[in-house]
């Protein structure tokens, strides 16, 4: 026994009080508008198709379809009893795209296109999205399009970003074979990229794809390896797309950050956090080659967008992301290091000369503070008891640091009897003196260290 | 990973020929030379000759110029090293090796070996 | 060609000594490159462009030098080191030292 569909609605005239299936009308295979109740909920009958008369003699409308009488009241029991025909019309007004790449008007055309395929035994058209086909679904007031602030960034600045691939030789055919890759971004429109030292290391072809495809030979223009700061160039005809600078001395702690790179051929790779740790201020972000501070961002920075840019939420540099990471941290070279570099590269190259020597002990260093201090502790047990000093990220091969014994994660506390709270302390010291006597904390251990600081070209 | 599987080890009477296949895995075979090095017992080692996979380049000690050839099969993964004319000082592990590269210095070295094949030349 | 000296040819040393072996060559070259080979097995890299470490080789391996000088160390003697050592030079084409026997005492 079937109870009667749509018991809300006013019983149509003559309808029975119990539904028996036997003795509905038997329907064909297919119907052109497909099917529905009839009048008294009882039995599946063909529906009217769209356009259609509906209501009085007509019988109901299919599925997804609503009858409606003109001035678009929508047809009721009242209405039939006052006989007055209606229209077939779809309950959907949107267009739709169809999985036989075709857009249909509206969701009611669809299922009768799916339901035409279907007696041709070929397979059910199905919706794969609102909105025509090839167009993406644009309506200003939905919420990916209102707080979708991270993508919007990505759009800007993409066409800027750079594949970077590198090529060495073999060493006897003389092939030439990938050896490895990375990114960059565009800061001139007549073709100077920055990038990673790193990614453009030695004894290489340098080969640059932009976002449209399109590559180039490259020229390394300079590099500072201290820094991990490269400048190459691509001769292309055309202004190019470029990023601007913004100022990594304006950063706050929290600010969202959006690191990307094109770790593959017109591909690009995103990844987004916070900044956790900036510079300490100003007069650190001067400092001299490698021994600097970084930005810490907990953006995900890796093979694939190393060289990259990491933006703020305007689409400005604020880092190049380098590849460096600890206690699963990641860390950016900042933005006012880059224009350090930059414009002392013009400056080079204008003067066609090297400027004054620079002294340098082979350290990548951050500020310890009482909070990142804290952090650390958390992630290493035997992270030493300090709450500032000069914690060293990295110790470069072949420098005086390693030379003197200078370990990473080793927190400088005193040099030369002045204590040290910030990596700002021990590159003023550096600047100054020609033999470092360090207390390094170790563990928990104190350890005198001596660096000798050497001079080299910027 | 990356690994290198000789064939087995070989008898040969001198003024013959040997054979000896290289089986490459776990890297893309034709971006990197493959090298053969021999070692006579108690001897240093001594570079033979090397092949390119992908073109089938060569390039030969002048030592061994005219007894060795190196070929390749790029749908194989296979190096190999036919020595000729062989006399008993030919005795000796032969070592497939592949060539290695430093990304920071540009220097070239062998990173991975086979596990070598020993060819005893005997009347 | 280039000639390659490496010496001693063989030396017995204490587990926890230093023990240090030396490559000369005939003309200067960039890089030296140094293997250790135990018996039966294939050589193994330990130190390439002059200094740097191989992967997994444990750090009390050391490389040094430049021209036509370079040494290896070996900072602390383990039982384990016991092998023959080789340098490597890679100008026009690859040749080796011609080994340094290591025993323990």
């Known amino acids: 026994q079937l109870s009667r569909a749509g018991r809300s609605a006013p019983l149509a005239a003559g309808c029975p009080d119990r539904c028996e299936p036997a003795r509905c009308p038997p329907q064909p295979e297919h119907c052109e508008g497909g099917r529905a109740r009839d009048a008294c909920g009882c039995c599946e009958v063909c529906g009217a198709p769209e356009g259609a008369a509906c209501g009085l003699q007509e019988g109901p409308c299919g599925e997804g379809l609503q009858c409606v009488v003109p001035f678009g009241v929508p047809a009721s029991a009242t209405v039939r009893r006052r006989a007055q025909a209606g229209l077939c019309v779809c309950a959907s007004s949107e267009p739709v795209c169809g999985s036989d790449a075709n857009t249909y008007a509206n969701l009611c055309q669809l299922r009768a296109a799916s339901r035409r395929s279907e007696r041709l035994h070929r397979p059910p058209v199905i919706v794969l999205q609102r909105g025509a086909c090839g167009q993406g679904q644009e309506d200003p007031n939905s919420l990916r399009h209102k707080y979708n602030f991270i993508a919007d960034v990505v759009e800007k600045i993409a066409p800027a970003v750079v594949h970077i691939e590198l090529f060495r030789k073999l060493p006897f055919s003389k092939r030439e074979v990938p050896v490895a890759s990375g990114s960059g971004f565009i800061v001139s429109e007549d073709g100077l990229i920055v990038t990673n030292a790193h990614v453009v290391t030695n004894k290489h072809r340098v080969k640059v794809e932009l976002k449209n495809g399109a590559t180039y030979e490259a020229k390394i223009k300079d590099v500072d390896e201290k820094a991990d700061i490269a400048l190459i160039k691509i001769d292309h005809q055309g202004k190019l797309p470029v990023l601007l600078l913004g100022r990594s001395s304006e950063l706050r702690p929290g600010e969202f950050v959006v690191a990307i790179g094109s770790p593959f051929s017109l591909q690009n790779t995103v990844t987004t956090g916070i900044v956790s740790t900036t510079q300490r201020g100003g007069k650190e972000l001067g400092l001299r080659n490698s021994d600097m501070d970084y930005i810490q961002t907990d953006a995900i920075i890796n093979y694939g967008n190393s060289g990259g840019p990491l933006v703020n939420l305007d689409g400005e540099v604020i880092g190049i992301n380098t590849l460096k990471v600890t206690a699963g941290i990641s860390f950016a070279i900042p933005s006012d290091k880059i224009k350090k570099f930059l414009t002392e590269s013009h400056d080079r190259q204008a003067k066609g000369k090297a400027i004054t020597k620079k002294k340098y002990i082979g350290i990548r260093m951050m500020s310890l503070t009482s909070s990142k201090a804290k952090e650390l502790k958390d992630r290493h047990r035997d992270f030493p008891d300090v709450i500032s000093g000069a914690y060293i990220i990295e110790v470069i091969p072949d420098t005086p640091a390693e030379a003197g014994g200078l370990k990473e994660n080793d927190v400088i506390i005193s040099i030369n009897g002045q204590s040290v709270v910030s990596a700002n302390d021990v590159s003023d010291v550096i600047k100054r003196e020609s033999t470092l006597n360090m207390v390094v904390r170790r563990g928990n251990e104190d350890i005198m260290i001596t660096v000798i600081p050497e001079e080299i070209d910027p | 990973q990356v690994q290198l599987v000789q064939s087995g080890a070989e008898v040969k009477k001198p003024g013959a020929s040997v054979k000896v296949s290289c089986k490459a895995s776990g890297y893309t075979f034709t971006d990197y030379e493959m090298h053969w090095v021999r070692q006579a017992p108690g001897q240093r080692l001594e570079w033979m000759g090397a092949i390119d996979p992908e073109t089938g380049g060569t390039a030969y000690n002048q030592k061994f110029k005219g007894r060795v050839t190196i070929t390749a099969d790029k749908s194989a993964s296979t190096a190999y090293m036919e020595l000729s004319s062989l006399r008993s000082e030919d005795t000796a592990v032969y070592y497939c090796t592949r060539e290695g590269y430093s990304y920071e210095g540009g220097g070239y070295y062998f990173d991975y070996w086979g596990q070598g094949t020993l060819v005893t030349v005997s009347s | 060609d280039i000639q390659m000296t490496q010496s001693p040819s063989s030396l017995s040393a204490s587990v926890g000594d230093r023990v240090t072996i030396t490559c000369s060559v005939s003309s200067s070259v960039s890089y030296m490159y140094w293997y250790q080979q135990k018996p039966g097995k294939a050589p193994k890299l330990l130190i390439y462009?002059?200094?740097n470490l191989a992967s997994g080789v444990p750090s009390r391996f050391s490389g040094s030098g430049s021209g036509t000088d370079f040494t290896f160390t070996i900072s602390s003697l383990q039982p384990e080191d016991i092998a023959t050592y080789y340098c490597?030079?890679?100008?026009?084409?690859?040749?080796f030292g011609q080994g340094t026997k290591l025993e323990i005492k």
């Open positions: 490597q030079q890679w100008s026009t084409y690859p040749t």
């Open positions: 462009d002059t200094s």
